[in-house]
């Protein structure tokens, strides 16, 4: 229903605390390079208008749209041009097309320096002077990092460090009972902004069409008893939360989310035999936990997909009726028997049914075209299942860290053109897909395994779109999003590519290589690695593995060395000789 | 919604012809092959001819072949049946289906063949 104070309806809804959370992660993942402070003092104002508007919904200002408050209170940041150029520029815009114009000006890969987290004893001593603002910090330094994260989510992990900074504050050893805990938390969130990017990215590329395509497979999977008109309904709803979301409408975003877990609690009967214990749960808690809720159990009776989709006489006659309609029976019914297929694998299969009907329903025989559509399949669901198999025998060869090695020196060959560190980082992302996904059991390695795969590789083209510099990446990334993967698999060494001069400066390390943390040194090893394959992209893996296990072993005694600048400076060429050497 | 609706039947002595039309609506007719079924009193259906959404590929039930011709007009979203040297037995309720379809969604026509 219209309210006469939106403002007032989302403070009302959604309480102060999370009011003020959702709008401090807006402002921050709009206004990037702004501080905490800064960002906190137009909270403050926002929140203190909210107020008035809930008091009096006719005082002056309260009809106005959130896009307009909002605009409003960026447009008035002193020194927004020096600070931000053109992003000003959207300020003599009107609504809508001014959050437009702030919404592609995020930045997917702000220049900002790594969220250091500091030591324990500092943290549990700011945390416990004033939690409130220990926890606006986070959400700033979160969402300006990642302006796409989605933000009732984010609230959720705030919530989850604060669990943890209340828990190890009190214990004697804060340092081990944090570590662990935070190193989890810092993961998981790290895979949900993967993930939601490639949400935002199908929303913005390819419209809500796909994102609800996307959304009927994986609702379809995890409730298989769930009727198509209940997937639908959940669909429909779960795909106006995301397109909130990532359009910058975050209370909105929220307040719906929390509609939806709300609908969800409430009609258990009809969706999945799974969700008492997240109902049970308070409302972020229970909305993450519905967000990754286990699979209902398969009905026993399902027919085969081949009476409704190929046997059936009324195929083309169904299809002529309602095009998406019996295109998304079909995914719902093929993705509810295939908890064990990856959403992408899903879309594809539904786009390769989708392209036979338009071609045999055309046909004068239309059954006798489309009878083997099934089998055509085939290819499709062996392609991602060798995938798995391949990288989840070598991970478990190599271990995460030789997998990540294996993984940079594939994809610097594909796309040497590519940035070193853009490698790096893609390189080791990939490579955590073995930790997370092949330790699991077979039949969830291929949906964990492909589904993050695409997320990453998301990733890789929205950096590479920035700068794009490599045909091949090019291609991959402006196909359709399900496609990517098989796209970036299917890739070669590069053969344009006219391979890079030798720079010993390249390969110069220094003492103070020893002192840096295990991450650190597996950073500076692996950059070697991949501007070695640039130098010589036609290399042997046992060329490479030669020239890196002389490299490992010459850090070793050199950090070991008594006398360690010595040591990197009369070792460090000879190594950088031998290197050559091995790769001539 | 898809409609289809049939005309042309009537009552014709043997040896006589007859031109069936069905004005197709609701969906991409171009896109989709079309065919004619029919049902004799007290029989099942049973598939008459087939073309395809071009209109370059044309099937036929043995019974009928070389005296039925179907044809297609696209900008006019127009399925035809020309139907000559009719027999006492192509005596039926003739239905245009979608594709390969053997049903009956829509009113069909009479054509009666009688001396």
């Known amino acids: 229903e219209a309210h006469k104070s939106e403002i007032a309806h989302r403070y009302n809804d959604l309480g102060e605390q999370h009011f003020k959370g959702l709008v401090l992660i807006a402002f921050s993942q709009y206004l990037q390079k702004c501080s905490y402070d800064e960002h906190a003092k137009l909270v403050q104002e926002v929140t203190d208008f909210a107020k008035t508007c809930v008091a009096d919904e006719s005082a002056a200002n309260c009809d106005k749209s959130l896009h307009t408050l909002f605009g409003d209170k960026l447009c008035a940041i002193p020194n927004l041009r020096e600070n931000y150029g053109e992003l000003a520029d959207c300020c003599t815009k009107q609504e809508p097309e001014r959050n437009e114009c702030f919404l592609q000006h995020k930045d997917d890969n702000p220049s900002l320096p790594p969220f250091e987290r500091p030591e324990a004893e500092a943290m549990c001593t700011s945390f416990k002077e004033n939690p409130t603002t220990f926890m606006g910090h986070y959400l700033h330094e979160v969402a300006r990092r990642h302006p796409y994260f989605y933000a009732p989510e984010l609230l959720y992990y705030a919530e989850q460090y604060n669990e943890i900074l209340t828990q190890c504050c009190a214990e004697a050893d804060k340092e081990s009972c944090l570590t662990p805990k935070l190193d989890g938390v810092k993961e998981k969130a790290l895979v949900s902004s993967v993930r939601q990017r490639m949400k935002c990215s199908s929303m913005q590329k390819f419209g809500e069409r796909a994102f609800k395509a996307w959304a009927v497979a994986r609702l379809s999977q995890t409730f298989p008893n769930a009727d198509f008109a209940e997937i639908t309904k959940l669909a429909t709803d779960l795909t106006k939360v995301n397109k909130e979301c990532c359009h910058g409408d975050l209370l909105e975003c929220a307040d719906d989310r929390a509609e939806l877990a709300k609908y969800m609690c409430e009609n258990q009967a009809t969706i999945s035999s799974k969700l008492q214990t997240c109902c049970d749960k308070p409302l972020l808690k229970k909305a993450h936990c519905l967000s990754e809720v286990e699979h209902d159990t398969m009905p026993a009776d399902l027919p085969a997909i081949a009476a409704d989709f190929v046997e059936d006489q009324e195929v083309c006659k169904n299809y002529a009726e309602a095009k998406d309609v019996f295109l998304g029976t079909f995914l719902y019914e093929y993705s509810r028997r295939h908890p064990d297929y990856s959403v992408s694998l899903l879309l594809r299969l539904a786009k390769k049914y989708e392209a036979t009907l338009e071609k045999c329903c055309a046909e004068a025989n239309p059954p006798a075209c489309y009878g083997t559509v099934l089998a055509e399949f085939q290819p499709l669901v062996e392609e991602p299942k060798n995938l798995v198999k391949t990288n989840c025998d070598l991970y478990e060869k190599l271990g995460e860290y030789g997998f990540q090695n294996a993984i940079l020196v594939r994809y610097t060959q594909k796309a040497p053109q590519v940035s070193t560190p853009t490698l790096v980082e893609a390189a080791r992302n990939l490579g955590r897909v073995g930790t997370k996904c092949c330790t699991l059991p077979e039949d969830q390695r291929l949906p964990c395994v492909e589904d993050y795969l695409s997320a990453i590789l998301n990733r890789v083209c929205l950096l590479h779109e920035k700068t794009p510099v490599s045909e091949h990446v090019t291609k991959c990334c402006s196909g359709s999003l399900v496609e990517r993967r098989p796209c970036f698999s299917a890739l070669t060494v590069d053969e344009t590519y006219v391979p890079k001069e030798f720079k010993a400066e390249t390969f110069t390390f220094h003492s103070d290589i020893c002192t840096l943390p295990e991450k650190e040194k597996q950073i500076k090893k692996q950059t070697a690695l991949a501007e070695l394959v640039k130098h010589k992209p036609k290399a042997t893996a046992e060329q490479l593995k030669t020239v890196m296990d002389d490299f490992a072993q010459f850090l070793d005694t050199c950090c070991k060395a008594a006398d360690k600048d010595t040591c990197f400076s009369t070792e460090g060429p000879n190594l950088v000789t031998r290197c050559k050497d091995a790769l001539a | 919604e898809v409609q289809l609706v049939e005309s042309g039947g009537g009552v014709v002595q043997p040896g006589n012809s007859l031109r069936l039309s069905c004005a197709a609506s609701?969906?991409?007719?171009?896109?989709?092959?079309m065919s004619w079924v029919r049902q004799a009193p007290g029989k099942g259906l049973e598939w008459v001819s087939s073309?395809?959404?071009?209109?370059?590929?044309?099937l036929y039930a043995d019974s009928v072949k070389g005296r039925f011709t179907i044809s297609r007009d696209n900008a006019k979203t127009t399925l035809y049946l020309q139907m000559n040297s009719l027999r006492p037995e192509d005596t039926a309720l003739y239905y245009c289906?979608?594709?390969?379809?053997?049903?009956?969604s829509s009113q069909g026509t009479l054509v009666t063949v009688s001396s």
């Open positions: 609701g969906f991409t007719f171009s896109s989709f092959g």
């Open positions: 289906t979608i594709g390969g379809s053997l049903s009956r």
């Open positions: 073309i395809s959404g071009s209109g370059s590929d044309t």
